[in-house]
């Protein structure tokens, strides 16, 4: 059996000619709708029946998941890291073996030194957040520790961090030059051996709101497109309105397929609409152009 | 945690001897690094020696070389301050302070831990 739906409808015409018949309403909602056979066989796309209606994957929606998205959230990080691999040679401490076992009372108190000079070393960087000693070993003391630095996410994040690790790298660099041993003793909090100082590596967090987007978008990838409201990324199609991708499709309806965006152009009692972008119109009785 | 407890602190004639000691609990191991600061009124608190409990080293500050003696008793877990030719500029309240580490910085902010202090008045 069938369950029909009774809606007025109105006629829709794609920028190729081919009128289709659609709901005013909605036009993602069927006419008629089988309750009968294999529900699973109804869900398009990859899409499931859930028991109740059918679950879709990004980017599809509708009650058979034929129809396409106009956005596609994507949630870039709050926060976005760096983390500097970086080692020191302080010389204001001898190295005993208690130092290579993290829960010993020495390791501990050297910890809470080494942290409270890196603290004071950086204390001018925004984007800092600590150092973590990694190892301890022979030579006075080679400190052998990450430098973690976080920023709030914004499109030129990368920029942000780089500076970042340059301040880093010139701190640290001055610190180990100006606080050294006198006379086989040391005046700072720590003193360090200017030639031990080195970068090891840099890892930047990577986050591509355009990878992202695309890989979200599946065979859709070359039609939708990242555009920043607010510093903050949307994944959208060009029949997402209010940005400056968007097509207007005028006396028309937006609609993705795998060519790309189309306008499908309505036709009302008076009027009929053509073009690609909906912005011919003709009057049914007198036959002629206005624009 | 390290605890320290000083002792031997007094008046004392200029030219005259006092002898300060310091008890040390608390350390997990027998290699540490243990000092004597001082702090005079109005002046920031300077080292006067500190030692290392394994003999590797020892430290005394230029104003009190040929005087001041550092010692410790490992056995006691015990730091001395033999003090001897006092002057009148050796008038301070005395700190004791101790690192789990093998300290070599006269900076009293790297080390961690302190004794409550003890009184020396040198005067006629």
């Known amino acids: 059996p069938l369950a029909t739906i009774p809606v007025s409808t109105t006629s829709l015409t794609s920028s190729e000619g081919s009128t289709i018949s659609t709901p005013s309403v909605d036009i993602s909602t069927p006419v008629t709708t089988s309750i009968v056979g294999d529900q699973c066989s109804r869900c398009k796309n990859g899409g499931f029946w859930d028991g109740l209606k059918c679950q879709c994957l990004t980017p599809y929606y509708g009650e058979s998941c034929e129809e396409v998205v106009n956005s596609i959230d994507i949630a870039p990080p709050e926060t976005v890291s760096a983390q500097m691999e970086l080692t020191v040679t302080v010389t204001s401490v001898k190295f005993t073996d208690e130092l290579k076992n993290h829960s010993s009372q020495e390791f501990r108190e050297f910890n809470k030194t080494f942290t409270e000079q890196m603290n004071i070393v950086y204390s001018g960087i925004p984007e800092y957040v600590g150092v973590n000693i990694t190892n301890l070993r022979l030579g006075s003391v080679v400190v052998e520790h990450d430098v973690l630095l976080r920023t709030k996410y914004t499109p030129e994040y990368k920029t942000a961090l780089d500076n970042a690790t340059e301040v880093v790298k010139q701190k640290i660099t001055k610190v180990t030059t100006e606080q050294i041993m006198t006379n086989d003793n040391c005046s700072a909090l720590m003193c360090f051996n200017t030639t031990g100082t080195q970068v090891q590596n840099i890892t930047v967090t990577q986050y591509d709101p355009v990878e992202e987007c695309r890989q979200k978008a599946e065979e859709y990838e070359d039609y939708f497109l990242v555009e920043y409201r607010d510093q903050k990324p949307y994944c959208i199609s060009p029949c997402e309105s209010g940005f400056n991708a968007s097509k207007n499709c005028n006396h028309g309806k937006c609609q993705m397929s795998q060519n790309g965006a189309r306008c499908l152009c309505v036709t009302t009692e008076t009027h009929w609409y053509s073009g690609e972008d909906c912005n011919q119109g003709t009057q049914k009785s007198h036959h002629h152009h206005h624009h | 945690d390290v605890q320290l407890v000083e002792s031997g602190g007094g008046v004392v004639q200029p030219g005259g001897s006092l002898r300060l000691s310091c008890a040390a609990s608390?350390?997990?191991?027998?290699?540490?690094?243990m000092a004597w600061f001082r702090q005079a009124p109005g002046k920031e608190r300077e080292v006067v020696a500190f030692i290392w409990t394994d003999g590797g080293r020892t430290y005394y500050a230029d104003s009190v070389k040929g005087r001041l003696t550092i010692s410790h008793d490992n056995a006691k877990n015990t730091l001395y301050l033999q003090m001897n030719s006092l002057r009148a500029e050796d008038t301070a309240v005395y700190y004791c302070?101790?690192?789990?580490?093998?300290?070599?910085?006269?900076?009293?902010?790297?080390?961690?831990?302190w004794g409550q202090g003890t009184m020396v008045t040198v005067s006629s």
């Open positions: 608390g350390y997990t191991s027998n290699r540490y690094s």
């Open positions: 302070a101790a690192s789990s580490l093998l300290l070599q910085t006269i900076n009293p902010r790297a080390w961690p831990y």
